[in-house]
């Protein structure tokens, strides 16, 4: 259930932290999986255990393999896995998909990008920064604590860049790297006046008695993010939640959908067991946001079953 | 499947003794510890004690201590919870629940069924 | 021993609704908490673990979060089915102890 994937490079430190959490006054117990061999804690060995953290200084492509953490609670132990993989250098500078952290998205207004791991190490600042290994320079790029801020981001800023720093362990130094995506996104965004895709104003929407029936309420109010925009359904003028009728429930469907680049969302009205009453109500799906309101108005009718009897007659 | 059965509904009368059990089926008895939680009528829930088949290793819960037994027959995978002497505050529900392994621990994962004890004069 | 204090001890909500619980410890429990449901006239069922992982088999409109003292259960969305009595509980330190419980009920 535990089980964590860490990789790094041979001759970089790695260190793996337990994927079960614990005190850090709880003892943690770390083995080599495959022979159950116990790892050392002097911190002369190259590979090392400390507490919750597991320290390949530096890490060999021998060292790859499942290893066990088990943290020792006054109630019960807890155990986890941390699949390990150290690969060779590349010699070229292609960073291949097996070595790279998450992808991050950046835009105009916000451009960090974490460098990934960096908590688990004892580093100095600054970190150096490269993307597509090329050492960046020039004052759009700012180096600030674990993170590198780009000003003013454009589409072109998108690539792989990878952190570089020194971990430092008893007066020793060993090089790490870390490689991660950053992806931009077009933050153009505008609002526009509520505009309904369904349903059509004044429409007839023809149920069966007796049988569950949904309405959607669907409209779009511009492009990205925005700050405000909701959709939600009125029984003669009030509230779902106030109209007080159990049958008749709202649920949100699709959330900021954004197809052609439009923020859409949906709001389902579900009515189970329709009846006869039903078809008195007036049904208002309404759409707001900063601009204003719209409202569309649907009316229920009666859908005649088909009376097989007379197909045949 | 893996699963806990409990022993059947019991009435006794005060000062009298009792013995419930909690067999297990379908997972390895004697790697798992096994617990007792009480459920008073209208009530929550308390924990009263564990036991590790393997080795016999029981802990308490300081307000339990004393006052039950728990012990376990891993031949026939059946835990139990006994009172020499019962009092009609122990009249409730209990259940046996099981607790992780020597070495791992995921919360109480599997439950029986619960058995009902009344005692009353 | 620890005390686990649950809040609300009732809530009534809408299908559809988010539900929210909370569950404060006496003291630092790590992540060392987990989530029971038991429905009227049944056991208790684990749905979450160490704080935040489901069990398998439980839906994913349940959830928790937090560490430390200070942790949460929510229902993204709630269902008929729901409908029951939520303990937080937490195994940090022998006696194991549970919060007084939650009693979820439909509007």
């Known amino acids: 259930k535990f089980s964590k994937q860490s990789w790094g490079l041979e001759n970089e430190a790695l260190i793996v932290r337990c994927p079960r959490q614990g005190k850090p006054s709880y003892t943690v117990d770390w083995y080599y999986s495959q022979t159950n061999k116990s790892i050392p804690t002097q911190e002369r060995n190259r590979v090392f255990a400390s507490g919750q953290l597991l320290k390949f200084l530096p890490a060999a492509v021998a060292d790859s393999g499942i290893y066990t953490c088990i943290v020792r609670s006054p109630t019960f132990n807890r155990t986890g896995y941390a699949n390990v993989t150290i690969y060779k250098k590349q010699s070229d500078c292609n960073v291949p998909d097996y070595l790279m952290y998450s992808t991050v998205s950046g835009s105009e207004k916000n451009s960090k990008i974490y460098c990934p791991t960096i908590d688990l190490y004892n580093w100095t600042a600054p970190l150096e920064w490269f993307k597509n290994c090329q050492a960046l320079q020039g004052s759009r790029y700012r180096a600030h604590k674990s993170f590198l801020v780009i000003d003013n981001v454009m589409t072109e800023d998108a690539g792989d860049y990878t952190c570089k720093f020194i971990h430092n362990e008893n007066g020793a130094n060993y090089s790490v790297t870390a490689t991660r995506s950053f992806t931009v996104k077009d933050e153009q965004g505008f609002s526009l006046f509520p505009v309904i895709g369904a349903p059509a104003q004044n429409e007839i929407k023809e149920v069966e008695i007796g049988k569950n029936a949904n309405l959607t309420c669907s409209a779009c109010f511009g492009k990205g993010t925005q700050f405000l925009a909701a959709v939600l359904w009125q029984l003669n003028g009030t509230k779902i939640t106030d109209f007080g009728e159990p049958r008749i429930q709202q649920e949100e469907g699709q959330n900021q959908s954004f197809s052609n680049g439009l923020a859409c969302l949906d709001m389902v009205l579900r009515i189970a067991d329709v009846k006869e009453e039903d078809l008195l109500l007036q049904y208002d799906c309404l759409a707001l946001n900063l601009h204003g309101l719209r409202r569309h108005t649907v009316r229920l009718s009666r859908k005649n079953p088909i009376d097989h009897h007379s197909i045949y007659c | 499947e893996v699963q806990l059965v409990q022993s059947g509904a019991e009435v006794k009368k005060p000062g009298e003794s009792l013995k419930i059990s909690c067999k297990g089926s379908?997972?390895?008895?004697?790697?798992?510890?096994i617990g007792w939680v009480r459920q008073m009528p209208g009530k929550g829930l308390e924990w009263m004690g564990i036991?590790?088949?393997?080795?016999?290793?029981?802990r308490f819960s300081p307000s339990f201590q004393g006052q039950v037994t728990i012990s376990a027959d891993k031949s026939i995978t059946t835990a139990y919870l006994q009172w020499s002497s019962l009092k009609a505050s122990d009249t409730a529900m209990y259940y046996c629940a099981r607790h992780g392994t020597s070495s791992d621990y995921y919360g109480l994962d599997v439950w029986g069924q619960g058995t009902t004890v009344t005692v009353s004069s | 021993d620890i005390q686990m204090t649950q809040s609300p001890s009732s809530l009534s909500a809408s299908v559809g609704d988010r539900v929210t619980i909370t569950c404060q410890a006496s003291q630092d429990i790590s992540n060392y908490l987990n989530w029971y449901q038991q429905k009227p006239g049944k056991a208790p069922k684990l749905l979450i673990y160490d704080a935040s992982n489901l069990e398998t088999g439980v839906p994913s409109r349940f959830s928790g979060s937090g560490s430390g003292t200070d942790f949460t259960f929510t229902i993204s969305s709630l269902q008929p089915e729901d409908i029951a009595t939520y303990y937080c509980?937490?195994?940090?330190?022998?006696?194991?102890?549970f919060g007084g419980g939650t009693k979820v009920e439909i509007k």
């Open positions: 036991i590790y088949p393997g080795n016999s290793d029981t």
């Open positions: 509980q937490q195994d940090d330190n022998f006696p194991l102890t």
């Open positions: 379908g997972y390895s008895f004697t790697n798992y510890w």
